[in-house]
Interface confidence: low
């Protein structure tokens, strides 16, 4: 029988009446156009909704937008369009919401063609009030907040000027011209690339990378011959042109660009690209595109300096620059990532790693599923997950995989069971242990979301017909109840819940269509009365993450430590609550060779944990570039994996000697840098 339909599924008592009392409809006095929704702050209940409607006239496009505000998680909305003087807001810039709980919002208005500059509306009180400000430039990008100080904003103008405000957009100053890309770093630092000759496109590969640490009073050129740059964790990366035949290399800095090292990664040609897939303060996952239009490349994982890289995964699916990759960080369990590979026969297969890219394996076949037509052997196959690539290919996949840091171990995704991803209609699968084991959760494609830190999962069937039914589960997707939230079905457009999965409210968005008109409508359902009591100690059970062999003393050890979590029992129907904090007990493991990556000049033969010297390098000096100097490496082949906390056990030693020689290949050496002041 289908999941949730067997007799042992206990029904939540009187849920229809409880939910009916907590279902709030809001019909928006709008013609249907587009709608965008933003949460302002964390746990504030404030939602802003911007509806936009374009009327194409013969000569020009007339636009109209309305702004609505809720302060009760979407149960009620108030039209606050008058606060922005009924101005048409440009949806391509979205609503720029300030970091943390600053309460700041910036909306960018549409202005008439001949105006000197753009116009913004600013609020610093969670959109209760707005101030109109005329800009001395036309913005090209959305206003970007400094992560450290929400009063500091930067924006690029349509004329490629870099503009900065120190008083939350009240006053603006152009600090540099001819700017292609600008990003905030840490400590209110701004990094940006500039062009010297024609344009950003014409100078690609000849750009300069600049830094200002004082909002434009002084500058330092920290790189030349730049193609692009990126920030990830504590790493600053620059893609640097290597020579006249248009290859480029990645350089990395961990001191905001003062010193650079050439990353030990392959160079790429004109048609190839690098992509930072994920980064934290310990390490980075880097994708390096294959030459030719292959649609795949190689994933490399870095050491703690971002310099030495280990090959992590071959034939990694990544279509083109800025294209599609299925790479997904499973945030509900440390060290877990899921992605897709393009196999030799051009089929797409899902791979998972539980140890931050050390080893990749296929996903275990769900026990309650059969292998599909793609499987050669009907008894042996794997689960394959649909993610960004499937969505881009217009497969019947409404949502990417979902996990939440505070819903420990839970991963929800569309998938198919066979030898490769199938183009057939997918089902929804759930894992409650971070991806080690999977169960079919729902037949057919659905939208889904996690509420109350995993206490409730909500789903809506993906259908082209109007819908009026929502499904919910209080036991991590084992059993499902259905609730009819309206008599009049709506054309469903999206599920919205507060980011962070702590809320117990879900908003169902859609539109109604009558003979003459269509209107936006939202239904907000509060599940607080379904989970009527607060969870107590007895509702939680101890769970050892990454456990695969309970008999083994080292069971659960990943990256040098194991973690025991307190997890809600599936049978407990109670509220984790908004203040729920994941309780975990870490314990350090003994070091083994698995806790070390292979150092520069070494590699791991397949199915072997030992790092062996590349045969042709035996007896030769190992030299590599570090901070623009040549280093001599004395090593026995191992370097501790970034973030690995193991102690004792195996302890290979390594030593690096400074050869005090310049690396002529390091295009970002200090002597090529200069400073200047405004």
């Amino acid at each position: 029988s289908a999941p949730g339909e067997d007799e042992e599924c206990g029904r939540v008592r009187d849920f229809v009446a409880k939910l009916a009392n907590n279902t709030h409809q809001h019909v928006f006095d709008d013609l249907r156009g587009s709608v965008s929704l933003s949460w302002v702050g964390d746990s504030t209940g404030v939602i802003l909704v911007l509806t936009t409607f374009h009327v194409p006239l013969v000569i020009m496009t007339f636009g109209q937008s309305k702004l609505y505000r809720s302060e009760d998680y979407g149960k009620n909305f108030k039209d606050i369009t008058d606060l922005i003087n009924n101005t048409f807001i440009r949806t391509e810039f979205g609503m720029a919401i300030g970091p943390e709980n600053s309460g700041k919002v910036v909306l960018t208005a549409e202005v008439s063609g001949g105006s000197r500059g753009g116009r913004i509306f600013r609020s610093s009180d969670f959109a209760k009030n707005f101030v109109q400000t005329d800009l001395p430039f036309h913005p090209l990008t959305q206003m970007m907040y400094s992560p450290q100080n929400s009063d500091y904003l930067l924006a690029l103008s349509t004329e490629n000027g870099l503009w900065v405000s120190k008083n939350f957009g009240g006053k603006w100053e152009e600090i540099h011209k001819a700017v292609c890309l600008a990003k905030w770093g840490s400590d209110n630092t701004i990094f940006f690339t500039t062009y010297a000759n024609g344009s950003c496109k014409a100078d690609l590969g000849a750009l300069e990378l600049w830094r200002t640490s004082d909002l434009g009073k002084s500058f330092k050129t920290i790189g030349v011959k730049i193609y692009s740059f990126g920030l990830g964790g504590r790493f600053l990366f620059a893609s640097v042109m290597a020579d006249k035949d248009t290859t480029r290399r990645i350089h990395v800095s961990t001191d905001q660009g003062d010193t650079w090292s050439m990353a030990q990664l392959p160079s790429v040609g004109q048609e190839q690209f690098y992509s930072i897939l994920a980064a934290n303060d310990d390490m980075v996952f880097m994708h390096v595109d294959e030459p030719g239009d292959t649609g795949f490349g190689t994933i490399f994982t870095s050491d703690d300096r971002g310099i030495v890289y280990s090959k992590s995964l071959d034939r990694h699916l990544y279509t083109t620059t800025g294209g599609e990759t299925d790479f997904t960080n499973v945030t509900s369990l440390r060290g877990v990532y899921i992605t897709s590979v393009l196999s030799e026969d051009n089929s797409i297969q899902t791979m998972i790693t539980f140890d931050q890219g050390g080893r990749w394996t296929h996903l275990r076949k769900p026990e309650n599923s059969e292998c599909d037509a793609t499987a050669k052997n009907k008894n042996e196959c794997s689960l394959h997950i649909h993610a960004s690539y499937s969505i881009s290919q217009k497969l019947n996949v409404p949502m990417a995989p979902l996990s939440e840091p505070n819903a420990v171990g839970i991963v929800i995704a569309h998938g198919s069971v066979g030898d490769a991803i199938s183009v057939m209609v997918p089902d929804v699968y759930i894992s409650d242990d971070g991806g080690y084991s999977w169960t079919k959760m729902l037949e057919g494609p659905h939208y889904y979301t996690i509420l109350d830190s995993g206490g409730i999962i909500v789903a809506i069937e993906h259908s082209s017909r109007p819908i009026n039914v929502i499904k919910f589960s209080t036991d991590e997707g084992q059993c499902w109840q259905t609730y009819t939230f309206t008599r009049d079905p709506i054309y469903f457009t999206g599920l919205a819940s507060e980011p962070g999965a702590r809320s117990m409210n879900i908003s169902i968005w859609g539109f109604t269509e009558s003979f003459l008109t269509s209107q936006w409508v939202s239904y907000t359902i509060d599940f607080k009365d379904i989970l009527e009591r607060n969870c107590e100690e007895k509702d939680y059970t101890i769970w050892l993450a990454h456990s695969t062999d309970p008999e083994d003393y080292e069971d659960g050890c990943i990256l040098g430590y194991k973690e025991q979590f307190l997890r809600l029992r599936k049978s407990s129907v109670c509220q984790n609550g908004r203040d729920y904090v994941v309780t975990k007990q870490p314990s350090i493991c003994l070091c083994s060779l698995e806790d070390f990556l292979c150092d520069f000049g070494y590699y791991r033969p397949e199915n072997d944990s030992k790092c062996v010297e590349q045969p042709e390098l035996k007896g030769h000096d190992l030299e590599f570039c570090l901070y623009g100097r040549e280093e001599h490496l004395t090593t026995n082949g191992y370097r501790k994996i970034p973030g690995d906390k193991c102690q004792g056990g195996v302890n290979p030693v390594r030593e690096v000697k400074d050869l005090k020689k310049k690396c002529t290949s390091n295009f970002l050496s200090p002597e090529k840098q200069n400073s200047k002041s405004n």
Epitope: A242, L265, S267, V288, Q614, L622, E630, C663
Partner: antibody
């Protein structure tokens, strides 16, 4: 344009040494490795070794270990291949070739191989008593 | 070391015909394989890299395929300038090794 220009033909006696140069132009010398390949008369191609112009680190085929030395001069964008203890079977055309191999080449390659895309014109070395 | 074996040693083909050259590796070289063309008295010229990607300026009649241990170079319609010796070369594990070559001659 990208070019590798090699030194002229050499005639050597058995037991002597020969040093062949290869001057690179048209690209950033330090951005690519350089391989040396030889071809005996009427025979196929034989890879001898590779040098990283950055640090000068080298990797040689086992067959030539102890007899071959590859060096580079970054100021003149030139690589050198010296073969000692010459024997008659070392009579061959010696080529330098730009090689975009992996980081610590040639180990397990970390991507599809680009191939040796630019070759010198070849230097004929004749070993005869 | 990885041994590369090319077959046939000689291939006699008429102009305009299709030529198929094989290269086998003694162990998997993944896609780390290149094909070269060499004419008498000239240096080799790169045709194909990454097993299947044509190098810059190489006509579309040349195509490479294969992965792992079996590789093929196909010349769809031989032109007079295509009669030469063709070598495959692996770069999966050092030392780099070449196949013995296939001579394509006029029939």
């Amino acid at each position: 344009q990208v070019q590798l220009v090699q030194s002229g033909a050499e005639v050597k006696k058995p037991g002597a040494s020969v040093k062949v140069s290869c001057k690179a132009s048209g690209y950033t010398f330090t951005s690519r490795y350089m391989s040396w390949v030889r071809q005996a008369p009427g025979q196929g191609l034989e890879w001898m070794g590779i040098i990283n112009p950055v640090g000068g680190s080298t990797s040689y085929a086992q067959k030539f270990q102890g007899r071959v030395t590859m060096t580079r001069d970054t100021s003149t964008s030139t690589v050198y291949m010296e073969l000692s203890s010459l024997r008659s079977e070392d009579t061959a055309v010696y080529y330098c070739a730009r090689d975009p191999s992996g980081i610590a080449a040639p180990g397990p390659a970390s991507r599809g191989y680009y191939g040796m895309d630019v070759w010198g014109q070849g230097t004929t070395v004749t070993v005869s008593s | 070391e990885i041994v590369m074996t090319q077959s046939p040693a000689t291939l006699s083909v008429s102009p305009g015909e299709r030529a198929t050259l094989s290269c086998r590796a003694s162990q998997s070289v993944s896609s780390n394989l290149a094909w070269y063309q060499q004419k008498p008295g000239q240096a080799p010229r790169l045709l194909i890299y990454g097993a299947s990607t044509r190098a810059t300026g190489i006509p579309a009649r040349f195509s490479g395929s294969g992965s792992g241990t079996e590789f093929t170079l196909t010349i769809s319609s031989l032109q007079s300038e295509d009669f030469a010796v063709y070598y495959c070369q692996q770069a999966r594990l050092g030392p780099w090794t070449f196949g013995g070559g296939t001579k394509v001659e006029i029939k």
